[in-house]
Amino acid sequence: HTAAQDNCTCPTNKMTVCSPDGPGGRCQCRALGSGMAVDCSTLTSKCLLLKARMSAPKNARTLVRPSEHALVDNDGLYDPDCDPEGRFKARQCNQTSVCWCVNSVGVRRTDKGDLSLRCDELVRTHHILIDLRHRPTAGAFNHSDLDAELRRLFRERYRLHPKFVAAVHYEQPTIQIELRQNTSQKAAGDVDIGDAAYYFERDIKGESLFQGRGGLDLRVRGEPLQVERTLIYYLDEIPPKFSMKRLTA
């Protein structure tokens, strides 16, 4: 796995332990929490990042209307089970044997149950809507400029292919970034939209996952774009299965 050979660190994931114990003395990095080897030339999967986070010390209108099936991550942090590829296992359980099914970004998509709960497959999140509100500026950003810079950000910082940035909508002060990636579209080596969205979310919160890089400093024609609120909606290829009780709560 590629890492910075000179000082043996992982540029794309600071929540790793790296040592020159790979083949031929090459730098190899393992994620905290899981101990899984990670590829430092690309983003680490959200599942491994969440696991690492849980293991770390605690101190460390033209706009889109989300569909009725859109999920928001209301459950927050948990210590997930990841498969050998670093993806979320379809069924997640806590220490008290409460279980639930998750989608490919690790967000709960069923009611909670017990150990008898079955989650037949990991359902893919194929559409992510990132809803941002920026701080007041002298004037509105130019929509085309904003589109260009946000696409550049996802392409350059998160290595997400531009074809997966479906649209950038803007109605001052609200910006919406739509990421779309069907199973059939995602080729080997492509960054997953869920991982890109997670890195972006952490960047926006000032909790960059990149090693030694400065935080996110986004400017549009020299004008800083400062985000004051973020909401992320997840749409799955198969709608979630919640009881009516939850839906009417």
């Epitope: 929509h143 085309s144 400029d145 589109d147 260009a148 810079e149 696409r151 550049r152 392409r155 350059e156 910082r157 292919h161 531009p162 074809k163 940035v165 479906a166 649209a167 950038v168 890089r213 400065g214 400093d217 400017r219 549009v220 024609r221 020299g222 004008e223």
Partner: antibody, heavy 117, light 111 residues
Framework: QVQLQESGPGLVKPSQTLSLTCTVS?????????WNWIRQPPGKGLEWIGY???????LYNPSLKSRVTISRDTSKNQFSLKLSRVTAADTAVYYC??????????WGQGTLVTVSS | DIQMTQSPSSLSASVGDRVTITCRAS??????????LHWYQQKPGKAPKLLIY???NLESGVPSRFSGSGSGTDFTLTIRSLQPEDFATYYC?????????FGQGTKLEIK
């Protein structure tokens, strides 16, 4: 008025490192935009080499990535290109240019670098 | 990498003529609100000069006889009434994906 000016040696020996500097006036390179190097071999087309952003982030052309370093000196309002292990194929006019929102609106006048022993 | 192909490679025309140069990308360079295709003019011994950005926007100071159109993979630069100072080489450039890539150029010569 934004102006860019390239400087550096016009002759470099094969296997050595090509070093060029671009001095920018009329705009602070740390205030915004992306600061690029582009080259043009004699009688041929344009090839993008890479950039350094207002915040110091780099992006390089994969075809040159293993040999290229673009850095900056904000106190002098300059950014620099280093291209290692040069061959005759690296002989070109080298331009620095500002990338506004993914197009090049200001260019230096260019400097010819010849790789020869 | 996205390949940019210009046609023709060279072109002879007279002052006053209407000239069209085309640029084809190997894959789409458009987004929902942007077309990441730009046109430059270069004269011998000089740096390229931006003419048109994002397919159809005229750069400040560029004469209105220049215009651009197209989307997706196919784009056109049109010079409405050629002037003596327009004889030069023209390049298209995409910035939808890195690495940024240029067309091979179209040399516009006096007939």
């Amino acid at each position: 008025q934004v102006q860019l000016q390239e400087s550096g040696p016009g002759l470099v020996k094969p296997s050595q490192t090509l070093s060029l500097t671009c001095t920018v006036s009329g705009y602070s390179i740390s205030s915004g935009y992306y600061w690029n190097w582009i080259r043009q071999p004699p009688g041929k087309g344009l090839e993008w080499i890479g950039y350094i952003s207002y915040s110091g982030r780099n992006l390089y052309n994969p075809s040159l990535k293993s040999r290229v370093t673009i850095s900056r000196d904000t106190s002098k309002n300059q950014f620099s290109l280093k291209l290692s292990r040069v061959t005759a194929a690296d002989t070109a006019v080298y331009y620095c240019a500002r990338d506004t929102t993914a197009y090049f609106d200001y260019w230096g006048q260019g400097t010819l670098v010849t790789v020869s022993s | 990498d996205i390949q940019m192909t210009q046609s023709p490679s060279s072109l002879s025309a007279s002052v006053g003529d209407r000239v069209t140069i085309t640029c084809r990308a190997s894959e789409s360079v458009s987004s929902s609100v942007n077309r990441f295709l730009h046109w430059y003019q270069q004269k011998p011994g000089k740096a390229p000069k931006l003419l048109i950005y994002r397919a159809s926007n005229l750069e400040s100071g560029v004469p209105s006889r220049f215009s651009g159109s197209g989307s997706g993979t196919d784009f056109t630069l049109t010079i409405r009434s050629l002037q003596p100072e327009d004889f030069a080489t023209y390049y298209c450039q995409q910035s939808n994906e890195d690495p940024y890539t240029f067309g091979q150029g179209t040399k516009l010569e006096i007939k």
